[in-house]
Interface confidence: low
Amino acid sequence: VLHYVVCFPALTEGYVGALHENRHGSAVQIRRRKASGDPYWAYSGAYGPEHWVTSSVSCGGRHQSPIDILDQYARVGEEYQELQLDGFDNESSNKTWMKNTGKTVAILLKDDYFVSGAGLPGRFKAEKVEFHWGHSNGSAGSEHSINGRRFPVEMQIFFYNPDDFDSFQTAISENRIIGAMAIFFQVSPRDNSALDPIIHGLKGVVHHEKETFLDPFVLRDLLPASLGSYYRYTGSLTTPPCSEIVEWIVFRRPVPISYHQLEAFYSIFTTEQQDHVKSVEYLRNNFRPQQRLHDRVVSKSAVRDSWNHDMTDFLENPLGTEASKVCSSPPIHMKVQPLNQTALQVSWSQPETIYHPPIMNYMISYSWTKNEDEKEKTFTKDSDKDLKATISHVSPDSLYLFRVQAVCRNDMRSDFSQTMLFQANTTRI
């Protein structure tokens, strides 16, 4: 029996203009951090991103991060070839720990992980991993985006050059080049077992300033399966002091994460202090608004064939410029509703813009997970006016993902619609 129905977007496709909406930050009135002279800052309120520049001048620079990356206008840089990773395939030692800093959850790496290539000036050592996430239900939480599309989580790995500095902090304080990788996490119907040690660790650092040692994990398994397709640009730290010293490597291909695993991020708390009252708040939407590119150029890797076999269905340009090989913007207003105990109705609206009319039909694609098996079905709706479809024989124990694509002449397609997750037989999500 379908007792409760919960339906939500699996991927928020908000453009940059939506970045200031739905921010659930608390009122922050702390003047300075107690233990140090670092200026206090927050992700919203009186000490939010628009005020960072008052205490950290670099936050007002012209080469700030994060940014939106428009793939179509990124130039291929022949110097950006395969990344060389060293130590990434080893299991982490039991000295690796995770901390809830109140602004993010950080993994402090205690093993030797090195990266070179990709135009980095030397062999860089990984220092730490940090995460940025949204509010709930797979909402946008990434700092960077590709073609305006943001992801539920962004993982950032920070590197420094150990030949030049004895520590990461020294490199920062001396305003010298560091490296950073950005990895997007995308909602998938199944748990990603590679993330289990991280998810388990999150449950041990729910409260601000909590620390825990992590079960062994393989850092390479937290990266996309294919590392060949990445973007490169010069930017900054995305938190104060916003130093413009970061060589960013942004991977195009996302890493899967299940909705259940995402919940561990949404369960993290932080503490805020107003005058003499301390309050406990959820740590959510811990991302900086995107910054203008100004006069910078984004490059993309020149690794042979790496861009051909990518997850382009996730990342095709949703902006649909005239040069896109798409016939329309995506179908919009996706909805999933139960018709009865075993059937669902998927509905949508016509794309806002059709570049190569007419739309001949719509393709509905849905996948589900049951007993660890992932299955997928696709069918076509011939009419371009009756914008709904019925899915029968729905299993109450399965998680479903739905998306719709418009099909035009010459088999040209639109971008895929927002993916909708549907979970039946759920009392609370």
Epitope: V16, D68, H294
Partner: antibody
């Protein structure tokens, strides 16, 4: 061919609100910065503000509060003007940035302009 | 506020080379664009990012930048080059942004 065209310019009395529309042909506005620029008779060009691909708006300091730029579809951008005075009499142009990948004030597509006259 | 300064008017003899300048504090850290505008017409982009010419612009028009001065050079001036020329740059930082126009230079071609 890619082009822009402004519409909505007319003679109005001071204080009357007015909305101008810029319509794009041959490309989608979702990737580009779209600026509004004006030119008073016999004077130079003056930037009013822009809306970027994501819908964020940026204004000249003198235009904040009185001028509002909005994207009404993938092919139209509006400029809403309030509290107009005779000083706002000008030809109003919309213009598109050359590339969306960076912004440097390089507008390669301009509309022919629409004349707004404020007079009592 | 950020101001771009251009000479109000410049004269050049037919067939000669003329340089139009544009100065501002910190222009060395900005890119300049140049536009040509003839009476009753919309401006036309001649140069962007200091030196780059869009397709369709004759190579008689070239741009350069040194220190806090951007320069538009027109070689072999023609009668049809008589127009107003504007330099443009951007100001702002982080997520703030402004486009700044110079006051314009009226070019007269004599002879």
């Amino acid at each position: 061919a890619q082009s822009l065209e402004e519409s909505g310019g007319r003679l109005v009395t001071p204080g009357t609100p007015l909305t101008l529309t810029c319509t794009a042909s041959g490309f989608s506005l979702y990737s580009y910065d779209m600026s509004w620029v004006r030119q008073a008779p016999g004077k130079g060009l003056e930037w009013i503000g822009l809306i970027d691909g994501g819908g964020n708006t940026y204004y000249a300091s003198w235009a904040k509060g009185r001028f509002t730029i909005s994207k009404t579809s993938s092919t139209t951008v509006d400029l809403k003007m309030t509290s107009l005075t005779t000083e706002d009499t000008a030809t109003y142009f919309c213009a598109r940035e050359l590339w969306p990948a960076y912004s440097s004030g390089a507008f390669n597509i301009w509309g022919p302009g629409t004349l707004v006259t404020i007079s009592s | 506020s950020f101001v771009l300064t251009q000479p109000a008017s410049v004269q050049v003899n037919l067939g000669q080379t003329v340089s139009l300048t544009c100065t501002a504090d910190t222009l060395s850290r900005r890119y300049a664009s140049w536009y040509q505008q003839k009476p009753g017409q919309a401006p036309v982009l001649l140069i962007y990012r200091d030196t780059r010419r869009p397709s369709g612009v004759p190579d008689r028009f070239s741009g350069s930048s040194s220190g806090n001065t951007a320069t538009l050079t027109i070689s072999g001036a023609q009668a049809g080059d008589e127009a107003d020329y504007y330099c443009v740059t951007t100001d702002g930082s982080g997520s703030s942004y402004l486009v700044v126009f110079g006051g314009g230079t009226q070019l007269t071609v004599t002879g």
